[in-house]
Protein backbone atom coordinates (compact mmCIF):
# COMPACT_ATOMS: atom_id res chain seq x y z
CA UNK A 1 0.00 0.00 0.00
CA UNK A 2 1.32 3.43 -0.91
CA UNK A 3 0.33 6.92 -1.94
CA UNK A 4 0.63 7.99 -5.56
CA UNK A 5 3.45 10.57 -5.78
CA UNK A 6 3.96 12.75 -2.75
CA UNK A 7 3.41 15.91 -4.76
CA UNK A 8 1.05 18.51 -3.23
CA UNK A 9 -1.73 16.58 -1.56
CA UNK A 10 -4.45 19.16 -1.14
CA UNK A 11 -7.58 19.21 0.98
CA UNK A 12 -8.17 22.97 1.17
CA UNK A 13 -11.28 24.38 -0.48
CA UNK A 14 -13.11 27.73 -0.42
CA UNK A 15 -13.92 28.52 3.21
CA UNK A 16 -11.54 25.93 4.65
CA UNK A 17 -7.80 25.91 5.17
CA UNK A 18 -6.68 22.27 5.32
CA UNK A 19 -3.48 20.22 5.07
CA UNK A 20 -2.92 16.49 4.34
CA UNK A 21 -0.54 14.72 6.72
CA UNK A 22 0.85 11.22 7.05
CA UNK A 23 -0.84 9.36 9.87
CA UNK A 24 0.10 6.48 12.16
CA UNK A 25 -3.59 5.38 12.06
CA UNK A 26 -3.68 6.09 15.80
CA UNK A 27 -5.03 9.59 16.25
CA UNK A 28 -4.24 11.44 19.46
CA UNK A 29 -7.96 11.72 20.28
CA UNK A 30 -8.05 7.91 20.62
CA UNK A 31 -5.64 8.15 23.53
CA UNK A 32 -6.90 11.46 24.95
CA UNK A 33 -10.70 11.47 24.40
CA UNK A 34 -12.52 14.80 24.05
CA UNK A 35 -15.90 15.64 25.52
CA UNK A 36 -17.41 17.05 22.33
CA UNK A 37 -16.94 15.12 19.09
CA UNK A 38 -18.39 15.47 15.57
CA UNK A 39 -20.95 13.18 13.93
CA UNK A 40 -20.00 10.59 11.33
CA UNK A 41 -19.37 11.15 7.62
CA UNK A 42 -22.38 10.91 5.30
CA UNK A 43 -22.62 9.20 1.89
CA UNK A 44 -19.16 7.63 1.74
CA UNK A 45 -18.47 6.76 -1.90
CA UNK A 46 -15.52 4.90 -3.39
CA UNK A 47 -14.69 4.59 -7.07
CA UNK A 48 -11.82 3.17 -9.03
CA UNK A 49 -9.95 5.96 -10.78
CA UNK A 50 -6.71 5.94 -12.77
CA UNK A 51 -3.83 8.34 -12.31
CA UNK A 52 -0.46 8.92 -13.97
CA UNK A 53 2.73 9.25 -11.97
CA UNK A 54 5.31 11.90 -12.81
CA UNK A 55 7.19 9.14 -14.68
CA UNK A 56 4.13 8.53 -16.88
CA UNK A 57 3.07 5.20 -15.34
CA UNK A 58 -0.67 4.58 -14.99
CA UNK A 59 -1.96 3.24 -11.66
CA UNK A 60 -5.39 2.35 -10.28
CA UNK A 61 -6.30 4.51 -7.28
CA UNK A 62 -9.20 4.54 -4.84
CA UNK A 63 -11.19 7.75 -5.23
CA UNK A 64 -12.79 8.40 -1.83
CA UNK A 65 -15.55 10.96 -1.41
CA UNK A 66 -17.83 11.87 1.46
CA UNK A 67 -19.99 14.72 2.77
CA UNK A 68 -20.67 16.19 6.18
CA UNK A 69 -23.95 15.95 8.01
CA UNK A 70 -25.71 19.29 8.40
CA UNK A 71 -25.64 19.45 12.18
CA UNK A 72 -23.92 21.66 14.73
CA UNK A 73 -21.20 19.09 15.35
CA UNK A 74 -19.19 20.54 12.47
CA UNK A 75 -18.18 23.23 14.96
CA UNK A 76 -16.12 20.53 16.69
CA UNK A 77 -14.78 18.85 13.55
CA UNK A 78 -11.00 19.18 13.48
CA UNK A 79 -10.29 16.92 10.51
CA UNK A 80 -10.59 13.37 9.20
CA UNK A 81 -8.54 10.20 9.18
CA UNK A 82 -8.65 8.15 5.96
CA UNK A 83 -7.66 4.53 6.38
CA UNK A 84 -7.18 1.83 3.73
CA UNK A 85 -6.71 -1.75 4.95
CA UNK A 86 -5.67 -4.44 2.44
CA UNK A 87 -7.57 -7.47 3.66
CA UNK A 88 -5.31 -10.30 2.49
CA UNK A 89 -2.14 -8.81 4.02
CA UNK A 90 -3.63 -6.79 6.91
CA UNK A 91 -1.49 -3.87 5.77
CA UNK A 92 -2.95 -0.47 6.61
CA UNK A 93 -2.15 3.02 5.35
CA UNK A 94 -3.63 6.22 6.73
CA UNK A 95 -3.61 9.93 6.01
CA UNK A 96 -5.04 12.76 8.07
CA UNK A 97 -6.90 15.83 6.90
CA UNK A 98 -6.03 18.54 9.40
CA UNK A 99 -8.37 21.52 9.38
CA UNK A 100 -6.46 24.71 10.06
CA UNK A 101 -9.60 26.84 10.26
CA UNK A 102 -13.05 26.34 11.79
CA UNK A 103 -15.82 25.01 9.58
CA UNK A 104 -18.92 27.10 9.17
CA UNK A 105 -22.28 26.17 7.66
CA UNK A 106 -22.64 27.52 4.17
CA UNK A 107 -25.19 27.34 1.38
CA UNK A 108 -24.13 23.88 0.17
CA UNK A 109 -23.08 20.68 1.92
CA UNK A 110 -19.36 20.28 2.66
CA UNK A 111 -17.79 17.63 0.41
CA UNK A 112 -14.31 16.09 0.61
CA UNK A 113 -12.34 13.90 -1.81
CA UNK A 114 -9.03 12.04 -1.84
CA UNK A 115 -7.61 10.06 -4.78
CA UNK A 116 -4.06 9.15 -3.86
CA UNK A 117 -4.24 5.62 -2.42
CA UNK A 118 -2.74 3.24 -5.00
CA UNK A 119 -4.65 -0.06 -5.10
CA UNK A 120 -3.64 -3.41 -6.59
CA UNK A 121 -5.56 -5.46 -9.17
CA UNK A 122 -7.84 -8.16 -7.76
CA UNK A 123 -7.50 -7.02 -4.16
CA UNK A 124 -10.08 -6.17 -1.50
CA UNK A 125 -9.75 -3.17 0.78
CA UNK A 126 -11.61 -1.83 3.78
CA UNK A 127 -11.84 1.92 3.30
CA UNK A 128 -12.72 3.96 6.39
CA UNK A 129 -13.26 7.67 6.94
CA UNK A 130 -13.10 8.69 10.60
CA UNK A 131 -14.05 12.18 11.68
CA UNK A 132 -11.71 13.75 14.22
CA UNK A 133 -11.60 13.90 17.14
CA UNK A 134 -12.68 10.28 17.55
CA UNK A 135 -15.54 9.61 19.99
CA UNK A 136 -15.20 8.87 23.69
CA UNK A 137 -15.16 5.10 24.49
CA UNK A 138 -18.97 4.82 24.85
CA UNK A 139 -19.79 7.52 22.30
CA UNK A 140 -21.59 6.93 19.01
CA UNK A 141 -19.16 5.88 16.27
CA UNK A 142 -18.22 8.70 13.93
CA UNK A 143 -16.79 6.77 11.01
CA UNK A 144 -18.05 5.08 7.86
CA UNK A 145 -16.50 2.04 6.16
CA UNK A 146 -16.92 0.12 2.93
CA UNK A 147 -15.27 -3.02 1.58
CA UNK A 148 -13.99 -2.18 -1.90
CA UNK A 149 -13.03 -4.80 -4.51
CA UNK A 150 -10.63 -3.79 -7.27
CA UNK A 151 -11.16 -5.55 -10.62
CA UNK A 152 -8.46 -7.92 -11.86
CA UNK A 153 -6.35 -7.48 -14.98
CA UNK A 154 -9.04 -9.02 -17.20
CA UNK A 155 -11.05 -5.82 -16.79
CA UNK A 156 -10.72 -3.68 -19.91
CA UNK A 157 -9.75 -0.50 -18.06
CA UNK A 158 -7.37 -2.30 -15.68
CA UNK A 159 -5.61 -4.17 -18.48
CA UNK A 160 -3.71 -1.06 -19.60
CA UNK A 161 -2.46 -0.01 -16.15
CA UNK A 162 1.24 -0.36 -15.37
CA UNK A 163 0.87 -3.17 -12.78
CA UNK A 164 -1.28 -5.23 -15.17
CA UNK A 165 0.93 -4.66 -18.19
CA UNK A 166 3.93 -5.65 -16.07
CA UNK A 167 2.26 -8.98 -15.35
CA UNK A 168 1.54 -9.63 -19.02
CA UNK A 169 -2.06 -8.42 -19.37
CA UNK A 170 -1.64 -7.39 -23.01
CA UNK A 171 -0.74 -10.90 -24.11
CA UNK A 172 -3.74 -12.77 -25.51
CA UNK A 173 -2.65 -16.35 -26.23
CA UNK A 174 -6.00 -17.30 -27.82
CA UNK A 175 -5.62 -20.90 -26.62
CA UNK A 176 -7.25 -23.70 -28.59
CA UNK A 177 -7.37 -27.29 -27.37
CA UNK A 178 -8.56 -30.26 -29.41
CA UNK A 179 -8.80 -33.93 -28.50
CA UNK A 180 -6.96 -36.25 -30.87
CA UNK A 181 -7.10 -40.01 -31.28
CA UNK A 182 -4.95 -42.24 -29.09
CA UNK A 183 -5.37 -40.23 -25.88
CA UNK A 184 -3.73 -37.04 -27.04
CA UNK A 185 -4.48 -33.32 -26.74
CA UNK A 186 -3.32 -30.74 -29.26
CA UNK A 187 -2.70 -27.34 -27.63
CA UNK A 188 -2.17 -24.25 -29.74
CA UNK A 189 -1.50 -20.69 -28.56
CA UNK A 190 -0.02 -17.39 -29.75
CA UNK A 191 3.46 -16.51 -28.53
CA UNK A 192 4.20 -13.03 -27.14
CA UNK A 193 6.90 -10.71 -28.52
CA UNK A 194 9.54 -11.69 -25.98
CA UNK A 195 12.25 -14.35 -25.93
CA UNK A 196 11.03 -16.11 -22.84
CA UNK A 197 10.04 -19.67 -22.07
CA UNK A 198 6.53 -20.93 -21.30
CA UNK A 199 5.09 -23.80 -19.35
CA UNK A 200 1.96 -25.77 -20.16
CA UNK A 201 0.27 -27.25 -17.11
CA UNK A 202 -2.25 -29.96 -17.83
CA UNK A 203 -4.65 -31.11 -15.12
CA UNK A 204 -7.29 -33.74 -15.86
CA UNK A 205 -10.41 -34.48 -13.80
CA UNK A 206 -13.17 -37.09 -13.75
CA UNK A 207 -16.48 -35.96 -15.26
CA UNK A 208 -18.19 -34.42 -12.23
CA UNK A 209 -15.35 -34.24 -9.72
CA UNK A 210 -12.79 -31.66 -8.73
CA UNK A 211 -9.88 -33.81 -7.57
CA UNK A 212 -7.41 -34.42 -10.36
CA UNK A 213 -6.75 -37.82 -11.91
CA UNK A 214 -3.76 -36.77 -14.04
CA UNK A 215 -1.23 -33.93 -14.04
CA UNK A 216 1.47 -33.13 -16.55
CA UNK A 217 3.88 -30.26 -17.14
CA UNK A 218 5.37 -29.40 -20.53
CA UNK A 219 8.20 -26.91 -21.02
CA UNK A 220 8.32 -24.70 -24.13
CA UNK A 221 11.70 -23.07 -24.83
CA UNK A 222 12.03 -19.36 -25.56
CA UNK A 223 11.01 -18.56 -29.14
CA UNK A 224 13.30 -16.83 -31.62
CA UNK A 225 12.32 -13.27 -32.70
CA UNK A 226 10.97 -14.52 -36.04
CA UNK A 227 8.55 -16.74 -34.09
CA UNK A 228 7.04 -13.86 -32.05
CA UNK A 229 3.23 -13.63 -32.45
CA UNK A 230 3.26 -17.01 -34.23
CA UNK A 231 1.20 -20.01 -33.10
CA UNK A 232 2.94 -22.65 -31.03
CA UNK A 233 1.53 -26.18 -31.36
CA UNK A 234 2.11 -28.87 -28.76
CA UNK A 235 0.77 -32.41 -28.57
CA UNK A 236 0.31 -33.78 -25.05
CA UNK A 237 -0.16 -37.47 -24.30
CA UNK A 238 -2.83 -38.28 -21.73
CA UNK A 239 -2.85 -41.19 -19.33
CA UNK A 240 -5.24 -43.88 -20.52
CA UNK A 241 -7.64 -43.68 -17.60
CA UNK A 242 -11.33 -44.29 -18.23
CA UNK A 243 -13.42 -41.36 -17.02
CA UNK A 244 -10.41 -39.02 -16.64
CA UNK A 245 -11.88 -36.89 -19.40
CA UNK A 246 -12.10 -33.24 -18.36
CA UNK A 247 -8.86 -31.41 -19.12
CA UNK A 248 -7.72 -27.98 -17.95
CA UNK A 249 -4.80 -26.54 -19.88
CA UNK A 250 -3.00 -23.60 -18.28
CA UNK A 251 -0.23 -21.63 -19.97
CA UNK A 252 2.26 -19.88 -17.73
CA UNK A 253 4.60 -17.35 -19.34
CA UNK A 254 7.85 -16.16 -17.76
CA UNK A 255 8.08 -12.59 -19.05
CA UNK A 256 10.99 -10.48 -17.82
CA UNK A 257 8.64 -7.97 -16.16
CA UNK A 258 6.90 -10.57 -13.97
CA UNK A 259 9.16 -13.66 -14.01
CA UNK A 260 7.33 -16.54 -12.32
CA UNK A 261 4.38 -14.37 -11.22
CA UNK A 262 2.86 -13.60 -14.62
CA UNK A 263 -0.83 -13.85 -15.45
CA UNK A 264 -1.75 -17.34 -16.57
CA UNK A 265 -4.33 -18.20 -19.21
CA UNK A 266 -6.33 -21.38 -19.32
CA UNK A 267 -8.76 -23.37 -21.45
CA UNK A 268 -10.88 -26.38 -20.55
CA UNK A 269 -12.00 -29.40 -22.54
CA UNK A 270 -15.21 -30.96 -21.24
CA UNK A 271 -15.95 -34.66 -21.14
CA UNK A 272 -17.74 -35.99 -24.23
CA UNK A 273 -21.52 -35.93 -23.96
CA UNK A 274 -23.01 -39.15 -22.64
CA UNK A 275 -25.76 -40.63 -24.86
CA UNK A 276 -29.22 -39.80 -23.46
CA UNK A 277 -30.69 -43.23 -24.04
CA UNK A 278 -29.04 -46.15 -22.25
CA UNK A 279 -28.37 -49.39 -24.14
CA UNK A 280 -31.63 -51.39 -24.36
CA UNK A 281 -31.85 -54.37 -22.05
CA UNK A 282 -33.21 -57.52 -23.69
CA UNK A 283 -36.65 -58.71 -22.53
CA UNK A 284 -35.26 -62.11 -21.56
CA UNK A 285 -31.81 -63.39 -20.76
CA UNK A 286 -30.81 -66.59 -22.54
CA UNK A 287 -29.55 -69.31 -20.23
CA UNK A 288 -26.82 -70.42 -22.61
Amino acid sequence: LRLLDHRALVCSQPGLNCTVKNSTCLDDSWIHPRNLTPSSPKDLQIQLHFAHTQQGDLFPVAHIEWTLQTDASILYLEGAELSVLQLNTNERLCVRFEFLSKLRHHHRRWRFTFSHFVVDPDQEYEVTVHHLPKPIPDGDPNHQSKNFLVPDCEHARMKVTTPCMSSGSLWDPNITVETLEAHQLRVSFTLWNESTHYQILLTSFPHMENHSCFEHMHHIPAPRPEEFHQRSNVTLTLRNLKGCCRHQVQIQPFFSSCLNDCLRHSATVSCPEMPDTPEPIPDYMPLW
Epitope: Q45, I46, Q47, L48, F148, E154, R157
Partner: nanobody, 126 residues
Framework: EVQLVESGGELVEPGRSLRLSCAAS????????MHWVRQGPGKGQEWVSG????????DYADSVKGRFTISRDNAKNSLYLQMNSLRAEDTALYYC???????????????????WGQGTLVTVSS
Protein backbone atom coordinates in the same frame (compact mmCIF):
# COMPACT_ATOMS: atom_id res chain seq x y z
CA GLU B 1 -27.33 6.75 -25.06
CA VAL B 2 -27.45 4.47 -22.02
CA GLN B 3 -30.53 2.29 -21.79
CA LEU B 4 -31.63 -0.31 -19.25
CA VAL B 5 -34.81 -2.24 -20.05
CA GLU B 6 -36.29 -4.64 -17.49
CA SER B 7 -38.72 -7.46 -18.30
CA GLY B 8 -40.21 -10.57 -16.73
CA GLY B 9 -42.42 -9.06 -14.06
CA GLU B 10 -45.93 -10.50 -13.68
CA LEU B 11 -48.58 -11.63 -11.21
CA VAL B 12 -47.58 -14.87 -9.45
CA GLU B 13 -48.81 -16.90 -6.49
CA PRO B 14 -46.79 -17.08 -3.25
CA GLY B 15 -44.12 -19.80 -3.35
CA ARG B 16 -43.71 -19.60 -7.12
CA SER B 17 -40.66 -18.45 -9.09
CA LEU B 18 -39.95 -15.67 -11.54
CA ARG B 19 -36.94 -14.57 -13.57
CA LEU B 20 -36.35 -10.89 -14.28
CA SER B 21 -34.09 -9.72 -17.11
CA CYS B 22 -32.44 -6.40 -17.81
CA ALA B 23 -31.09 -5.60 -21.29
CA ALA B 24 -28.33 -2.97 -21.25
CA SER B 25 -27.00 -0.83 -24.08
CA UNK B 26 -25.07 2.38 -24.67
CA UNK B 27 -22.10 1.64 -22.35
CA UNK B 28 -19.41 -0.99 -21.76
CA UNK B 29 -21.59 -3.35 -19.76
CA UNK B 30 -18.72 -5.68 -18.81
CA UNK B 31 -16.86 -2.91 -16.95
CA UNK B 32 -19.48 -2.02 -14.35
CA UNK B 33 -21.13 -3.51 -11.30
CA MET B 34 -24.90 -3.81 -11.67
CA HIS B 35 -27.71 -3.89 -9.12
CA TRP B 36 -31.38 -4.67 -8.59
CA VAL B 37 -33.38 -2.21 -6.50
CA ARG B 38 -37.10 -2.46 -5.66
CA GLN B 39 -39.85 -0.18 -4.44
CA GLY B 40 -42.88 -1.72 -2.81
CA PRO B 41 -46.29 0.01 -2.68
CA GLY B 42 -46.08 2.92 -0.25
CA LYS B 43 -42.47 2.07 0.63
CA GLY B 44 -39.07 3.60 -0.06
CA GLN B 45 -36.49 2.13 -2.38
CA GLU B 46 -34.73 -1.01 -1.15
CA TRP B 47 -31.47 -2.35 -2.55
CA VAL B 48 -32.01 -6.04 -3.41
CA SER B 49 -28.80 -7.39 -4.90
CA GLY B 50 -25.55 -6.45 -6.62
CA UNK B 51 -23.05 -8.19 -8.88
CA UNK B 52 -19.47 -7.30 -9.80
CA UNK B 53 -18.33 -6.51 -13.35
CA UNK B 54 -17.44 -10.15 -14.14
CA UNK B 55 -20.02 -11.90 -11.94
CA UNK B 56 -17.44 -13.27 -9.51
CA UNK B 57 -18.87 -11.37 -6.53
CA UNK B 58 -22.53 -11.11 -5.56
CA ASP B 59 -24.39 -9.72 -2.56
CA TYR B 60 -27.99 -9.77 -1.35
CA ALA B 61 -30.22 -7.90 1.07
CA ASP B 62 -31.04 -10.04 4.11
CA SER B 63 -34.71 -10.09 3.10
CA VAL B 64 -33.99 -12.04 -0.12
CA LYS B 65 -30.87 -14.04 0.83
CA GLY B 66 -31.23 -17.71 -0.05
CA ARG B 67 -34.26 -17.09 -2.29
CA PHE B 68 -32.98 -14.73 -5.00
CA THR B 69 -29.99 -15.23 -7.32
CA ILE B 70 -28.40 -12.45 -9.35
CA SER B 71 -26.38 -13.27 -12.48
CA ARG B 72 -25.15 -11.62 -15.65
CA ASP B 73 -24.19 -12.55 -19.19
CA ASN B 74 -21.64 -10.03 -20.45
CA ALA B 75 -21.72 -11.49 -23.95
CA LYS B 76 -25.44 -10.63 -24.12
CA ASN B 77 -25.21 -7.35 -22.13
CA SER B 78 -27.82 -8.76 -19.79
CA LEU B 79 -28.50 -8.84 -16.05
CA TYR B 80 -30.84 -11.36 -14.40
CA LEU B 81 -32.64 -11.92 -11.11
CA GLN B 82 -33.94 -15.41 -10.39
CA MET B 83 -36.61 -15.11 -7.69
CA ASN B 84 -37.72 -18.28 -5.91
CA SER B 85 -40.14 -18.89 -3.03
CA LEU B 86 -41.81 -15.55 -3.65
CA ARG B 87 -43.73 -13.89 -0.82
CA ALA B 88 -46.40 -11.20 -0.72
CA GLU B 89 -43.80 -8.76 0.66
CA ASP B 90 -41.76 -9.17 -2.54
CA THR B 91 -44.47 -7.27 -4.41
CA ALA B 92 -42.74 -4.23 -5.90
CA LEU B 93 -41.46 -2.44 -8.95
CA TYR B 94 -38.05 -3.92 -9.68
CA TYR B 95 -35.40 -1.69 -11.22
CA CYS B 96 -32.05 -2.58 -12.68
CA UNK B 97 -29.39 0.06 -11.99
CA UNK B 98 -25.86 0.77 -13.19
CA UNK B 99 -23.16 1.74 -10.72
CA UNK B 100 -21.63 5.11 -11.58
CA UNK B 101 -18.03 4.24 -10.75
CA UNK B 102 -15.77 1.27 -11.42
CA UNK B 103 -15.13 -1.29 -8.67
CA UNK B 104 -17.46 -3.22 -6.40
CA UNK B 105 -18.44 -2.88 -2.74
CA UNK B 106 -19.67 -5.70 -0.55
CA UNK B 107 -23.20 -5.43 0.78
CA UNK B 108 -24.34 -2.60 -1.47
CA UNK B 109 -23.05 0.02 -3.83
CA UNK B 110 -19.73 1.90 -3.78
CA UNK B 111 -21.14 4.98 -5.44
CA UNK B 112 -24.44 6.33 -6.71
CA UNK B 113 -26.43 4.71 -9.50
CA UNK B 114 -26.21 6.93 -12.57
CA UNK B 115 -28.69 5.04 -14.77
CA TRP B 116 -31.92 3.19 -13.98
CA GLY B 117 -34.42 1.21 -16.00
CA GLN B 118 -38.13 2.03 -16.07
CA GLY B 119 -38.89 -0.94 -13.78
CA THR B 120 -40.88 -4.16 -14.10
CA LEU B 121 -43.80 -4.92 -11.79
CA VAL B 122 -43.80 -8.09 -9.70
CA THR B 123 -47.06 -8.84 -7.87
CA VAL B 124 -47.16 -11.79 -5.47
CA SER B 125 -50.72 -12.63 -4.52
CA SER B 126 -53.02 -15.60 -4.26
Amino acid sequence: EVQLVESGGELVEPGRSLRLSCAASGFNFDEYAMHWVRQGPGKGQEWVSGISWNGDNVDYADSVKGRFTISRDNAKNSLYLQMNSLRAEDTALYYCAKEEGLGYCRGGSCSTFDYWGQGTLVTVSS
